[in-house]
Interface confidence: medium
């Protein structure tokens, strides 16, 4: 008789990443009997919710239900009905909601309350919606990539799963770039973490980790751009802002009220003699880079060394996975290859930013203009942040690996968050069983 597969004994979990610019839903799956093994959880679906981040719904909370419908219905289709009631759903909101909460705790609570009510209408085991801290965002991103790379496993492998995986148990650092914040997380080499706020202690699979992490609020790529515009418009002689971070020939009208809507631009706010101004691109990488550097205060450091704005940063150690917008932007610019040196990346950025806007629109006809217009700034910002902000050098650049997915799962904080909340990362090394349960009869 033919061997017949028994029904899969699997579990599912759902995490919604409510970011500043959009929300994504991730569905994870794992074998029920291997919950405590490392590397068994994998992503089976990603659904990007159409529309902005949830913080933008503050004046129209009754639209949140509609906004989440498509992706929640998709989850209902992907996960077998018999599993719906035992599938946990978590929503974590990041820097967009942290900023809203800074402006008004009441408004942030109102948005989360409507999100919770909307998600409770589905047949899953809804576990709540909350704003995660920047420290959590950094820590869970670090856990995700190291879990997927097999760094927590005690079994050394003779083969490499992914091209950039070195066959050792040294963990990767995590570099995460969002729209409103950016995180840096790694295990420093025998270095005291001088500021307690930046220190995390983990015991995972029987091993202790002393981890450094910091989240820079307002230094995600979108908020950094708003900061730069607010800074530069202060010294503009009229309502024309000649901007080196946009392609020559590019024009965009910006409302001053939009510019000052975010807490991130408060330090640059001033009364301007106009309600609107026009960005006119001049496309000059070097000048753009110089303008971005003015966002980083490096003149003050109360520690042995700092990143910027007086924030402690130990000497960089080991390899780093750079994901989220670090990856998306560099992927678009075709700069994710391990073979591309930092000097080459800079050279390519100079050429890209100098290209006329009309030429860019023709070359990338399939890309929406609103995204296309940003890549010169975003690419330059990434270089500035990594080199001057975090002190990577031309030599250590080769230790940065731009990662989108690892073994089919997105790099990001969501997997680490779910692993933690479902208690799937044991403190001690689980006792290994000689054979897993047989799947076939």
């Amino acid at each position: 008789t033919q061997n017949k597969a028994l029904p899969e004994n699997v579990k599912y979990g759902i995490v919604l990443d409510a970011g500043s610019s959009h929300t994504s839903l991730y569905i994870y799956k794992w074998p029920a009997e291997k919950e405590n093994d490392t590397g068994v959880v994998h992503q089976v679906e990603e659904c990007r919710v159409k529309g902005p981040g949830i913080s933008k719904f503050v004046q129209k909370v009754n639209e949140i239900g509609i906004y989440l419908t498509d992706c929640m219905e998709r989850a209902r289709e992907v996960i077998p009905r018999s599993q719906h009631q035992e599938t946990p759903v978590y929503l974590g909101a990041t820097a967009g909601m942290r900023l809203l909460r800074m402006e008004s705790e009441e408004l942030a609570d109102r948005v989360l309350d409507v999100v919770e009510r909307s998600l409770s209408n589905y047949p899953f085991d809804f576990q709540g919606a909350r704003i995660i801290t920047g420290q959590e965002e950094g820590a869970y991103g670090w856990i995700t990539i190291n879990y997927l790379l097999g760094k927590f496993s005690q079994k050394t492998r003779w083969f490499s799963i992914v091209p950039y995986e070195t066959n050792n148990q040294e963990t990767f650092g995590a570099l995460d770039l969002g729209g409103a914040s950016t995180q840096v997380t790694f295990v420093p080499q025998n270095q005291t973490i001088e500021s307690p706020d930046n220190a995390l202690q983990f015991r995972l699979y029987g091993k202790d980790y002393n981890v450094y992490t910091h989240s820079f609020l307002c230094y995600g790529k979108d908020q950094a751009l708003w900061q730069k515009l607010a800074k530069d418009i202060q010294v503009a002689s009229n309502e024309i802002l000649r901007d080196p971070c946009f392609h020559p020939g590019y024009k965009k009208v910006v409302n001053v009220s939009d510019l000052y809507k975010t807490p991130c631009t408060k330090r640059f706010e001033m009364t301007l003699p106009f309600q609107q101004f026009e960005i006119q691109g001049i496309g000059n990488y070097q000048q753009c880079h110089q303008s971005i550097l003015e966002l980083f205060n490096t003149s003050y450091c109360p520690y042995s060394q700092c990143a910027f704005n007086g924030i402690f940063l130990p000497p960089l150690q080991g390899d780093f996975g750079a994901f989220s917008a670090f990856y998306f932007v560099m992927k678009f610019l075709n700069l994710t290859s391990e073979k591309v040196s930092q000097e080459k990346v800079t050279e390519m950025m100079k050429k890209f930013c100098a290209q006329p806007w009309e030429e860019i629109k023709t070359s990338y006809a399939g890309v929406k203009e609103k995204y296309l217009s940003e890549y010169c700034f975003s690419g330059t910002y990434i270089l500035s942040l990594l080199l001057q902000g975090y002190h990577f050098t031309a030599d250590s650049w080769e230790h940065i690996h731009f990662i989108g997915k690892i073994q089919g799962s997105d790099a990001g904080w969501t997997l680490g968050y779910m692993l933690n909340l479902t208690n799937m990362i044991p403190a001690e090394q689980p006792l290994s069983t000689p054979l897993s349960h047989s799947t076939y009869v």
Epitope: G51, G53, A180, D222
Partner: nanobody, 122 residues
Amino acid sequence: QVQLVESGGGLVQPGGSLRLSCAASESIVSFNAMGWYRQAPGKQRDLVAAITSGGRTNYAESVKGRFTISRDDAKNTVYLQMNSLKPEDTAVYYCHAIGGSTWFGEDEPDYWGQGTQVTVSS
């Protein structure tokens, strides 16, 4: 600027039916969602029904089973079929579109029609 034009409103007896149409001046494919809101005199504007870009629908509890929202992307039009109408359905009905996401995390645009009056009375 996207223009939304509603039509199909009017006076109808309780238990009767009406079909509202909302024609957009440009392609509705890029909108995240389109919907119908209503506003009775002295009341706030409330969501009646919405349809997302993926074709999923959402309805206010008070109209479930009686109203049906649909869209025709080829005609850039959204419809609201209203059956078993009740006097409490009397209101101005507004078509609404939620635009696609915008430049570096800006708020996405909202578009509204001028409204069409629906009166349910014997």
